[in-house]
Interface confidence: medium
């Protein structure tokens, strides 16, 4: 099933101690899906979208950037025929970096 879209959303982090907010959204015909956020191939967080919504926002606490490296991806799962879980393709990667202080 089609990949979700993924995006870093405001407020953006300015240091590694700041929280990171990543939104993930399934296509229009998949509301209420279960979403998984990955970083460097490892599961970071799981969230379920409300039954009338197509997306979730992962709120990662400060210091999450020190977790295993690599970009973030997300994926969603829905119940298909015979109540079997179907997993989407992985989203495109999204990168997180921190602005260089301009003092």
């Amino acid at each position: 099933i089609p990949a979700p879209s993924i995006r870093l959303v405001p407020p953006y982090p300015s240091s590694q101690e700041d929280p990171i907010h990543i939104a993930c959204m399934a296509p229009g015909n998949f509301p209420g899906a279960n979403f998984t956020l990955y970083r460097g191939g490892q599961v970071v967080q799981l969230l379920q979208a409300p039954t009338d919504q197509r997306g979730v926002t992962f709120n990662l606490s400060g210091g999450s950037s020190k977790a295993p490296g690599g970009p973030f991806h997300c994926q969603y799962g829905v119940l298909g025929e015979l109540n079997q879980s179907q997993l989407s393709d992985l989203s495109e990667p999204v990168n997180v970096s921190f602005p260089v202080p301009t003092w």
Partner: antibody, heavy 120, light 110 residues
Framework: QVQLVESGGGLVQPGRSLRLSCAAS????????MHWVRQAPGKGLEWVAV????????YYADSVKGRFTISRDNSKNTLYLQMNSLRAEDTAVYYC?????????????WGQGTLVTVSS | QSALTQPRSASGSAGQSVTISCTGT?????????VSWYQQFPGKAPKLLIY???HRPSGVPDRFSGSKSGNTASLTVSGLQAEDEADYYC??????????FGGGTKLTVL
């Protein structure tokens, strides 16, 4: 106060290139996602592209994908739009706009726009 | 990337209320709350009026309000004033990286 000032527009022949700039001041430019939105004469608004606060993630409208490139220089507080292989239908006023500080809080600041005319 | 559907024009007398609709699909307006409204005067840049369906930025009069039902978002201008005469655009995300605008509605104050 927040100011976004676009420049670089003008008359250009089809197939040629142009680079637009958007100079930002009055806010911490490096902390905000930035968009380009255009408006053809007498027509509605059309989203063109967005770039993340740090420049690492970029997304484009299908109509410009592969021809336009959005970029930014946070050390100069400047947003750019490199437009290649221009077509007559790219004729429009091009606005730069900043994302809000809150989650999906809309495009809260806009420049005054710069007119790009593609004609032979 | 088809535009969201808005009426081409709307009108109302001074002091009255007028509502402008913005119809999309379950893939955009109906699938989340990321709907914004903008006001634009001729020859000027757009100005943000409403974000996340119903939130007003500071400085926007409370005469402007937003709502959503199903796949349709609405902007209501109550207590119409002459200076409200302008073009109004709705906006929504088709996916997280694809912003869409409505075709625009010209509001006339009679």
């Amino acid at each position: 106060q927040v100011q976004l000032v676009e420049s670089g527009g003008g008359l250009v022949q089809p197939g040629r290139s142009l680079r637009l700039s958007c100079a930002a001041s009055g806010f911490t430019f490096s902390s905000y996602g930035m968009h380009w939105v255009r408006q053809a004469p007498g027509k509605g608004l059309e989203w063109v592209a967005v770039i993340s606060y740090d420049g690492s993630n970029k997304y484009y409208a299908d109509s410009v994908k592969g021809r336009f490139t959005i970029s930014r220089d946070n050390s100069k507080n400047t947003l750019y739009l490199q437009m290649n292989s221009l077509r007559a239908e790219d004729t429009a006023v091009y606005y730069c706009a900043s994302e809000g500080v809150d989650f999906w809080s809309g495009l809260d600041y806009w420049g005054q726009g710069t007119l790009v005319t593609v004609s032979s | 990337q088809s535009a969201l559907t808005q009426p081409r024009s709307a009108s109302g007398s001074a002091g009255q209320s007028v509502t402008i609709s913005c119809t999309g699909t379950s893939s955009d307006v109906g699938g989340h709350n990321y709907v914004s409204w903008y006001q634009q005067f001729p020859g000027k840049a757009p100005k943000l009026l409403i974000y996340e369906v119903s939130h007003r930025p500071s400085g926007v009069p409370d005469r402007f309000s937003g709502s959503k039902s199903g796949n349709t978002a609405s902007l209501t201008v109550s207590g119409l004033q002459a200076e409200d005469e302008a073009d109004y655009y709705c906006s929504s995300y088709a996916d997280l990286n694809n912003l869409m605008f409505g075709g625009g509605t010209k509001l006339t104050v009679l």
